[in-house]
Interface confidence: medium
């Protein structure tokens, strides 16, 4: 003989795959205080319970260890805890109270659990700026994961030099010591929920601050093709009166500030150009000598110089005697 009772609260609950949900259940108020029995949660249409506190009763293999009856008859609690929710948990469930000593049991109304695809993705947090050569701690977190679920597995993927730091149920720390070449490369945190067999990931692009490593000068002489110098040059022959365009280029992140100086500048020298471009419309005696491009950056500066040697036109020389 069965007595029916209505589960209080919702008729359906939603949970994301791999996460947890609590199916609320309160024992009927009409239940005698002396009623002694066991509680069983069943999948609609099944004979074997998904969870019970009856030590002699088997539970379904599929739900063993993931479904738990939270049994507290004094507080009238018969809730069902589901962790590591799986796609096939998407079903209707009901609770049954049975006693070997009483002639009647209680059966609840059903409640549907709806398991949706996991859409939450891990968060990657970076404290401040990533600086070349300096270790930084990156944290991959899944704050929406429930504590009672099977702890997720964290995997990191990066080309930069890294080492694993501490981890909790909901987060993993990665220590990264980036190099200039790691700027704009990908870093991925992958989180796998072994209880449900679901994997989620997030990828970010590293923004690494670094001082200029390379500085170069491209030289445009009249109509002739440009050529590039990558190191200090002792002497560059130029024809008198020729137009010359010097283009300075440096790496570094954020971009270095480029400026041109005549001679070998002191730290506080005044530049002759505040950009990376130096235009010399007519090379003459005033332009003979050294020109320096300085790439200034908060993390360090770099400079490159070239020396102009002016070839005089023969007729120009004769006219000057």
């Amino acid at each position: 003989q069965e007595r029916r009772f209505q589960l209080e609260g919702p008729e359906s609950l939603t949970v994301q795959e791999g996460l947890c949900v609590l199916v609320p259940c309160r024992l009927p108020t009409t239940l005698p205080a002396s009623y002694y029995g066991y509680g069983y949660w069943f999948l609609e249409g099944a004979d074997v319970p998904v969870a019970t506190n009856d030590p002699d009763e088997e539970v379904q293999e599929e739900t063993r260890g993931r479904f738990h009856l939270l049994w507290d008859p004094r507080r009238k609690n018969c809730s069902l805890s589901i962790r590591d929710a799986r796609r096939r948990d998407n079903a209707a469930y009901f609770f049954r109270l049975k006693s070997k000593w009483m002639k009647y049991g209680y059966t609840s109304s059903k409640l549907s659990v709806r398991v949706m695809a996991l859409t939450h993705r891990p968060n990657i947090s970076i404290p401040g700026t990533l600086e070349s050569g300096h270790p930084s701690n990156l944290t991959c977190s899944v704050p929406w994961v429930c504590e009672q679920g099977t702890p997720p597995i964290f995997s990191w993927m990066s080309a930069a030099p890294t080492s694993l730091g501490p981890r909790t149920t909901q987060s993993s720390v990665l220590t990264i010591t980036p190099r200039p070449q790691d700027h704009s490369t990908n870093l991925t945190c992958q989180v796998t929920f072994p209880g449900a067999g679901v994997t989620m990931e997030r990828t970010i692009q590293l923004n690494v601050s670094y001082a200029p490593q390379k500085v170069a000068i491209s030289i445009f002489q009249g109509n002739s093709a440009a050529f590039k110098i990558l190191q200090n040059t002792s002497s560059l022959p130029v024809l008198e009166g020729q137009a010359l365009r010097l283009l300075c280029d440096a790496d570094g992140n954020p971009p270095a500030h480029l400026s041109w100086f005549q001679g070998f500048p002191a730290l506080n020298a005044t530049p002759i150009s505040n950009t990376g471009v130096l235009e010399l419309p007519q090379v003459g005696s005033a332009e003979e000598g050294d020109f320096t491009c300085r790439a200034q950056h908060p993390l360090g500066s770099l400079q490159i110089s070239l020396s102009l040697f002016v070839h005089w036109k023969p007729e120009g020389r004769a006219g000057g005697v």
Epitope: S12, L13, T14, R87, A92, R114, A117, H120
Partner: antibody, heavy 120, light 107 residues
């Protein structure tokens, strides 16, 4: 292309019943719950209930139990909502909306709405 | 039933601005919140679900955030076509309930 085509506007007398249809196309009908939502004039949205077309299982908002009955005809991929004992309070636009019950989204496609007017 | 409260019935903004529409649940809904846009004479359109997941084809100027009981829909770089009613909805437990709606007006 996913489409939910609802039946046309209805003018009904108080006390009567009406059956609104929602014909689905462009997807597997039994793979999605069909939900029904009420929107009274100038008001917000109210969830009436849903039906799992695969097994005909329904869940209702307590407020609409006894008022609405949800059914499906799998052969024609059509969902129905019957409203009975109509009163002026039932005058509203009624929408059907699908929900992938294992899937990535909520009410991702909606019907165009059916306007029900209850007047003597 | 879970009550979803959208405290602002109307919000006014200008094209290019950023606007945040808020929604409060009467209990923890574990990020099971969706946002819909409804333009005059049209059916609602899904924008965001599970608090922050953008639905397919929704422009990335629409962003959802929140957890527990407090949720926000942010529209950055507001466009003239964003003039609409915006509803939040909890999909944690039945009956699924909607907020009262926030009407976004363009100055």
């Amino acid at each position: 292309e996913v489409q939910l085509q609802q039946s046309g506007p209805e003018l009904m007398k108080p006390g009567a019943s009406v059956k609104i249809s929602c014909k689905a196309s462009g997807y597997t009908f039994t793979d999605y719950y069909m939900n029904w939502v009420k929107q009274s004039h100038g008001k917000s949205l109210e969830w009436i209930g849903d039906i799992n077309p695969k097994i005909g299982d329904t869940i209702y908002n307590q407020k609409f139990k006894g008022k609405a009955t949800l059914t499906v005809d799998k052969s024609s991929s059509t969902a129905y909502m019957e409203l009975r004992s109509l009163t002026s309070e039932d005058s509203a636009v009624y929408y059907c909306a699908r929900w992938d019950y294992y899937g990535s989204s909520l009410f991702d496609y909606w019907g165009q709405g059916t306007t029900l007017t209850v007047s003597s | 039933d879970i009550v979803m409260t959208q405290s602002h019935k109307f919000m006014s903004t200008s094209v290019g601005d950023r606007v945040s529409i808020t929604c409060k649940a009467s209990q923890d809904v574990t990020t099971a919140v969706a946002w819909y846009q409804q333009k005059p004479g049209q059916s609602p359109k899904l924008l965001i679900y599970w608090a922050s997941t953008r639905h397919t084809g929704v422009p990335d100027r629409f962003t959802g955030t929140g957890s527990g009981t407090d949720y926000t829909l942010t529209i950055s770089n507001v466009q003239a076509e964003d003039l609409a009613l915006y509803y939040c909805q909890q999909h944690y437990s039945t009956p699924y309930t909607f907020g009262g709606g926030t009407k976004l007006e363009i100055k």
